[in-house]
């Protein structure tokens, strides 16, 4: 079958998910496409524990995550509910700032140098993190 029971080479396993950390930058949409071609998605942070894990691996570097509001409300790329889910915004963020002079506001979320989140111009070439879940069926104990 197509079940993934262990992480691909160069990916890091953590809590039944696999993570890949880029070392170069792309715009948010291009990073999103990159992850899709890896049969993954931009990282979706669902807990403080996952936040700490990702933060440990990326260090103090602006890094895209799978959260955006390009179509209005904030949405996670995998459909995880934003309103009821984990959040770790910097104070007074997101602010959809228009003062950057690049046109439009700020529609894509990234980890900042201290790990907390900020919204920024989606075209900025930041690093990114891909995530893919290990097959849930593989967590089931074998039938005896």
């Amino acid at each position: 079958g197509s079940e993934r029971t262990c992480c691909p080479v160069n990916w890091v396993e953590h809590e039944r998910s696999c993570y890949w950390f880029s070392r170069s930058g792309k715009a948010w949409a291009d990073a999103d496409n990159y992850c899709r071609l890896e049969d993954a998605h931009l990282v979706v942070v669902t807990s403080w524990e996952e936040q700490k894990f990702v933060q440990h691996h990326i260090g103090p570097v602006n890094t895209w995550m799978g959260l955006h509001d390009q179509n209005g409300p904030w949405k996670w790329v995998d459909g995880t509910d934003y309103e009821t889910g984990f959040k770790n915004w910097r104070p007074e963020q997101p602010d959809d700032w228009y003062g950057h002079g690049l046109g439009g506001g700020e529609d894509c979320a990234h980890f900042t140098d201290d790990g907390r989140w900020n919204d920024d111009v989606c075209q900025r070439p930041y690093r990114w993190v891909c995530e893919t879940e290990l097959d849930k069926a593989s967590q089931e104990p074998p039938l005896l």
Epitope: S24, K26, L37
Partner: antibody, heavy 117, light 107 residues
Framework: EVHLLESGGGLVQTGGSLRLSCAAS????????MTWVRQAPGKGLEWVSV????????FYADSVKGRFTISRDNSKNTLYLQMNSLRAEDTAVYYC??????????WGQGTLVTVSS | DIQMTQSPSSVSASVGDRVTITCRAS??????LAWYQQKPGKAPKLLIS???SLQSGVPSRFSGSGSGTDFTLAISSLQPEDFATYYC?????????FGQGTKVEIK
């Protein structure tokens, strides 16, 4: 050793259809996204399409969108390109290639598609 | 789409010469650039990825440099097997696009 072998090219009338295949060996096929790149006679390279390892994600060049369909059968280690509504400008050598970090690290020898009117 | 422009379109050189080919992107692609070599009737071969990373098995006389919009492929001492056409490719954004090619010919 990585090996990619295209087949299925040939002469077809304008408006006709053709299905190209690319047989892969020497690596874990399902772990890699695969692409098609074409080269018109005496011209440069043009990226056509890409498909993720599972087949669940696909992207196309605007020039072929709606006419070409990329697919794969991981049980057969084979990549496909279904080409419909062919035009004279689709005449080219079609290469399959393995995606490597958005680059193409291994290529097949190519198969020639000629669209005549 | 990102346009890639190579120059020159062809260059005549002798064995032992240093040859440089440039590639310009229509927008910033940071270091998402590859160089390929293609010989007549053959498939392209990846030489360099990420602007400057030499692929395994590629001779050290090949080198790549640049970032942003301007990139260079250099061949330090041209060998007989290096006469071919060279293409750059941007891997920053879909659709992935190639330069028009630079043919390195024997003088």
């Amino acid at each position: 050793e990585v090996h990619l072998l295209e087949s299925g090219g040939g002469l077809v009338q304008t408006g006709g259809s053709l299905r190209l295949s690319c047989a892969a060996s020497g690596f874990t096929f399902s772990s890699y996204a695969m692409t098609w790149v074409r080269q018109a006679p005496g011209k440069g390279l043009e990226w056509v399409s890409v498909i993720s390892g599972s087949g669940g994600n696909t992207f196309y060049a605007d020039s072929v969108k709606g006419r070409f369909t990329i697919s794969r059968d991981n049980s057969k280690n084979t990549l496909y390109l279904q080409m419909n509504s062919l035009r004279a400008e689709d005449t080219a050598v079609y290469y399959c290639a393995r995606r490597y970090g958005d680059y193409f690290d291994y290529w097949g020898q190519g198969t020639l598609v000629t669209v005549s009117s | 789409d990102i346009q890639m422009t190579q120059s020159p379109s062809s260059v005549s050189a002798s064995v032992g010469d240093r040859v440089t080919i440039t590639c310009r992107a229509s927008q910033d692609i940071t270091d998402w650039l590859a160089w390929y070599q293609q010989k007549p009737g053959k498939a392209p071969k990846l030489l360099i990825s990420a602007a400057s990373s030499l692929q395994s098995g590629v001779p050290s006389r090949f080198s790549g440099s640049g970032s942003g919009t301007d990139f260079t492929l250099a061949i330090s001492s041209l060998q007989p097997e290096d006469f071919a056409t060279y293409y750059c490719q941007q891997a920053n954004s879909l659709p992935w696009t190639f330069g028009q090619g630079t043919k390195v010919e024997i003088k």
